[in-house]
């Protein structure tokens, strides 16, 4: 028996359902009574879901997993993982035993898009050219950790005097705060780009300083 899984990681958005694909080629005359199927976490071997003795033994993992019972006899051993969480990320092994055995691992990559950044300025009044200002770009509830880029109005990257911090909340999602300290010119636009490296999703925020008033 040969077990096949997708070589590319499965990317799943937080709170959505994901399917970890696994298949095998049944021999002629195969019946489900002959099948033993185990899904387990690759690193710890923690049991996730099992099928044995002709019966789905159910989820051993937060009661959020399911097989596709009608497709098992055709060799479809895929696992459905519901309401994906950050903590579900990792490698899952599909182990199939009939008169022979084989196993293969599939990676689950969890992702969550970042919110549109909000921009704040300090100080935010009586601004004059030559003043040092602090611009903060904040984006929320994303995963995994973001990449943050700053540019000026001409699209020139701003890399000096940038401090970025990322904090995970209780669900494992990140809030990102990036602070740019810059000396004001006569006027200017400062933009912040928050990129989710897995989703290749870019969230943009900008602030334009033209004396008074400020535009965000």
């Amino acid at each position: 028996v040969e077990v096949q899984v997708s070589e590319d990681p499965v990317v799943a958005l937080v709170d959505t359902d994901a399917t970890l694909r696994c298949s095998f080629s049944p021999e002629p005359g195969f019946s489900l009574a002959q099948l033993n199927l185990i899904w387990q976490l690759t690193d710890t071997k923690q049991l996730v879901h099992s099928f044995t003795e002709g019966r789905d033994q159910g989820s051993a993992y937060s009661n959020r997993t399911a097989l596709f019972p009608d497709l098992l006899v055709q060799g479809n051993a895929s696992l459905r993982l519901q309401r994906v969480r950050v903590t579900d990320e990792g490698s899952y092994t599909c182990f199939v035993s009939i008169q022979d055995f084989d196993s293969a691992a599939v990676s689950l990559q969890v992702a969550a898009p970042y919110s549109k950044p909000s921009m704040t300025l300090e100080p935010n009044k009586d601004l004059r050219p030559g003043n040092m200002v602090t611009i903060t770009c904040s984006s929320y509830q994303g995963y995994p950790e973001a990449e943050v880029f700053w540019k000026d109005g001409q699209g020139v990257p701003l890399t000096g005097n940038v401090t970025t911090s990322q904090m995970a909340n209780e669900r494992g999602l990140f809030d990102v705060h990036s602070v740019l300290r810059v000396v004001l010119g006569a006027n200017g636009t400062y933009s912040c780009l928050v990129r989710n490296p897995v989703l290749q999703q870019d969230a943009h925020g900008s602030v334009t300083i033209t004396g008074q008033p400020l535009t965000f």
Epitope: V1, E2, E27, A33, Q34, N36, I38, Q40, K45, Q46, L47, S50, T52, E53, Q57, A60, F95, S97, I98, Q99, D100, F101, D102, S103
Partner: antibody, heavy 118, light 110 residues
Framework: EVQLLESGGGLVEPGGSLRLSCAAS????????MHWVRQAPGKGLDWVAV????????YYADSVKGRFTISRDNSKSTLYLQMNSLRAEDTAVYYC???????????WGQGTTVTVSS | QSVLTQPPSASGTPGQRVTISCSGS????????VNWYQQLPGTAPKLLIY???QRPSGVPDRFSGSKSGTSASLAISGLQSEDEADYYC???????????FGGGTKLTVL
């Protein structure tokens, strides 16, 4: 008739090596996983290792991991167990067995005796 | 020390019914099938029960197996003198990816 015939056992000193063979007949050898199971004198059965039909997957008991290697030659319908760094506690009758549904072992050889002693 | 627990011995008189127990855990018997082997004196083991309750062809229906939770049992009814042997339960341990045997039960027919 399905048959398994082990060979290669014998007396070996501690730290020595031995290679066991198991010749299979009467079934499509490459379609089945195969095990080695041992039994020390007067003791119970002790699982040693397993290999899948195409030889790409293996598992070992902790007690032999890193010292024993299970392999197979499907063109010769033969299973092997290479045993290195042998210890006195490896003394046993070694059986090769055929993989069966639901993790069972449905055919057993007659066994070959390995004695590790100085 | 065996991962699966069996009584070291059991006995019965001819015609009697004898039961041998096998206790495991959630990751072996609780997750997968139990198989039973009979080893007559001086011979190789023989598969007696697979998939917890199935008999291979040639095994008399006096032998039956059952499983509940993390325990299993082998029942032999109408005990005969030729049933005197060692009996082993076995399973696959999903937490270790290894096969595990019970310590064996020596059955004596009185």
């Amino acid at each position: 008739e399905v048959q398994l015939l082990e060979s290669g056992g014998g007396l070996v000193e501690p730290g020595g090596s031995l290679r066991l063979s198991c010749a299979a007949s009467g079934f499509s050898f490459s379609s089945y996983g195969m095990h080695w199971v041992r039994q020390a004198p007067g003791k119970g059965l002790d699982w040693v290792a397993v290999i899948n039909g195409e030889g790409s997957g293996t598992y070992y008991a902790d007690s032999v991991k890193g010292r024993f290697t299970i392999s197979r030659d499907n063109s010769k319908s033969t299973l092997y167990l290479q045993m290195n760094s042998l210890r006195a506690e490896d003394t046993a009758v070694y059986y090769c067995t055929k993989y069966y549904y639901n993790y069972a072992m449905d055919v057993w050889g007659q066994g070959t005796t390995v004695t590790v002693s100085s | 020390q065996s991962v699966l627990t069996q009584p070291p011995s059991a006995s019965g008189t001819p015609g009697q019914r004898v039961t041998i127990s096998c206790s495991g855990s959630r990751t072996d018997i609780g997750t997968t099938s139990v198989n039973w082997y009979q080893q007559l004196p001086g011979t190789a083991p023989k598969l007696l029960i697979y998939q917890s309750h199935q008999r291979p062809s040639g095994v008399p229906d006096r032998f039956s197996g059952s499983k509940s939770g993390t325990s299993a049992s082998l029942a032999i009814s109408g005990l005969q003198s030729e049933d005197e042997a060692d009996y082993y339960c076995a399973s696959w341990d999903a937490s270790q990816n290894t096969w595990v045997f019970g310590g064996g039960t020596k059955l004596t027919v009185l």
